[in-house]
């Protein structure tokens, strides 16, 4: 139903990384515009992206208010130039999104190795604690602030001269690993939330190798 030249949105999809959250949908509009509404299960609907010709809407500002809540969005379709026009049932066409719980579903962004420091046969590798758009007391929280011990990091490391990888894991953002004296090593890290059922792992960080400027070597 609805006016003859209006079609309902479809393929509503949440795209979210480190809580930066965008709702996408189809189709590209022809003679129509969209408005998005978002709500928690128990809350009121809030309108965003009014009368847009885009097929995406950034809902980050809404979901970061409480990342542990479950959200539902819907996309309304209106005839272009006649947004007061409604479907035959007396209201505009709309389509519901799947439910979305940011804490459980946002993708973990690619981590970055902040630094590594060798002291004798030990290397301390530090992972950058990436800032998110989640706020508390007017400050932006880091990934670790949000996820606490639900978030772990896995370090893959290997001698530059070989391909055999070793693994270390941490509940903090730091690793302290044993290495062979006089050998250069390469490192890559991955963020993991073991308790999740979906989107448990990030992509691997860019590889960083000893002998490059990011690290520091100290002979003790």
């Amino acid at each position: 139903s609805g006016t003859t030249n209006t079609v309902a949105a479809y393929n509503l999809t949440w795209k979210s990384t480190n809580f930066k959250t965008i709702l996408e949908w189809e189709p590209k509009p022809v003679n129509q515009v969209y408005t998005v509404q978002i709500s928690t299960k128990s809350g009121d609907w809030k309108s965003k992206c009014f009368y847009t010709t885009d097929t995406e809407c950034d809902l980050t500002d809404e979901i970061v208010k409480d990342v542990k809540q479950t959200y539902l969005a819907r996309v309304f379709s209106y005839p272009a130039g006649n947004v007061e026009s409604t479907g035959s049932a007396g209201e505009p066409l709309y389509e519901n999104s799947p439910e979305f719980t940011p804490y459980l579903e946002t993708n973990l962004g690619q981590p970055t190795i902040q630094s590594f420091e060798q002291v004798g046969t030990k290397v301390n590798v530090t992972v950058e604690d990436e800032r998110t758009l989640v706020r508390r007391n007017n400050t932006f929280l880091s990934l670790r602030d949000v996820f606490g011990k639900d978030l772990i990091y896995t370090l893959y490391y290997w001698k530059s001269s070989s391909s055999g990888k070793k693994t270390a894991k941490t509940n903090t953002n730091e690793f302290l690993i044993d290495v062979d004296k006089g050998e250069n090593y390469c490192f890559s890290v991955q963020a993991v939330i073991p308790s999740r059922t979906v989107n448990r792992k990030s992509t691997d960080s860019p590889v960083e190798c000893m002998g490059q400027e990011k690290g520091e070597f100290r002979e003790i």
Epitope: R144, G148, K149, N171, S195
Partner: antibody, heavy 118, light 106 residues
Framework: QVQLQQPGAELVKPGASVKLSCKTS????????MHWVKQRPGQGLEWIGE????????NYNQKFKGKATLTVDKSSSTAYMQLSSLTSEDSAVYYC???????????WGQGTSVTVSS | QIVLTQSPAIMSASLGEEITLTCSAS?????MHWYQQKSGTSPKLLIY???NLASGVPSRFSGSGSGTFYSLTISSVEAEDAADYYC?????????FGGGTKLEIK
């Protein structure tokens, strides 16, 4: 509901070893790292180490390396801590515990009281 | 390792009084967590990540701080608050606890 069951007490002789158990139920055992904490009588808390039950990866407090060995049995959802070469300094209550940030909850066993005495 | 020093070691408070327990870290930590332990029982999480109330904890408890100085405040002490209180950091290995503050009710 979540339960972490630990035996109430163990009496062991100096120089011997003891293997403490922490049987879990009510949650997915492999989803959360298990931690062990020591508390001597009338004293504070000391972190011993942690284990990832999914693959038995461990991190230890350097102070307890060689003293404590953490293991798990996934089939019975049980975590273990073996304490070796026991002395009177090892007489304490030992807790197993894990934390779930999503629920802002932590869960603790009741603790096992280990007494080292001849 | 990061050493956490709590003060006072023992505190006596009257019912309804507001009290503050402090925890000083030997080097900067990202956040502090607070535990309550009543006699003969396991510790219980009160505050996580410096200022967040753990599940089921009464709102009279609050936490604040940053860097090397953190505090736990009870806005109106009740009889059931008699316990040992520990600060705890898991920012860096090995994780450490403060020596504890024993709260007694007058």
């Amino acid at each position: 509901q979540v339960q972490l069951q630990q035996p109430g007490a163990e009496l062991v002789k100096p120089g011997a070893s003891v293997k403490l158990s922490c049987k879990t139920s009510g949650y997915t055992f492999t989803s959360y790292w298990m931690h062990w904490v020591k508390q001597r009588p009338g004293q504070g808390l000391e972190w011993i180490g942690e284990i990832d039950p999914s693959d038995s990866y461990t991190n230890y407090n350097q102070k307890f390396k060689g003293k404590a060995t953490l293991t798990v049995d996934k089939s019975s959802s049980t975590a273990y801590m073996q304490l070796s070469s026991l002395t009177s300094e090892d007489s304490a209550v030992y807790y197993c515990t894990y934390y779930v940030n999503y629920y802002a909850m932590d869960y603790w066993g009741q603790g096992t009281s280990v007494t080292v005495s001849s | 390792q990061i050493v956490l020093t709590q003060s006072p070691a023992i505190m006596s408070a009257s019912l309804g009084e507001e009290i503050t327990l402090t925890c000083s870290a030997s080097s900067s930590v990202s956040y502090m967590h607070w535990y309550q332990q009543k006699s003969g029982t396991s510790p219980k999480l009160l505050i996580y990540s410096t200022s967040n109330l753990a599940s089921g904890v009464p709102s009279r408890f609050s936490g604040s701080g940053s860097g090397t100085f953190y505090s736990l405040t009870i806005s109106s002490v009740e009889a059931e608050d008699a316990a040992d209180y520990y600060c705890h950091q898991w920012s860096s290995y090995p994780y450490t606890f403060g020596g504890g503050t024993k709260l007694e009710i007058k």
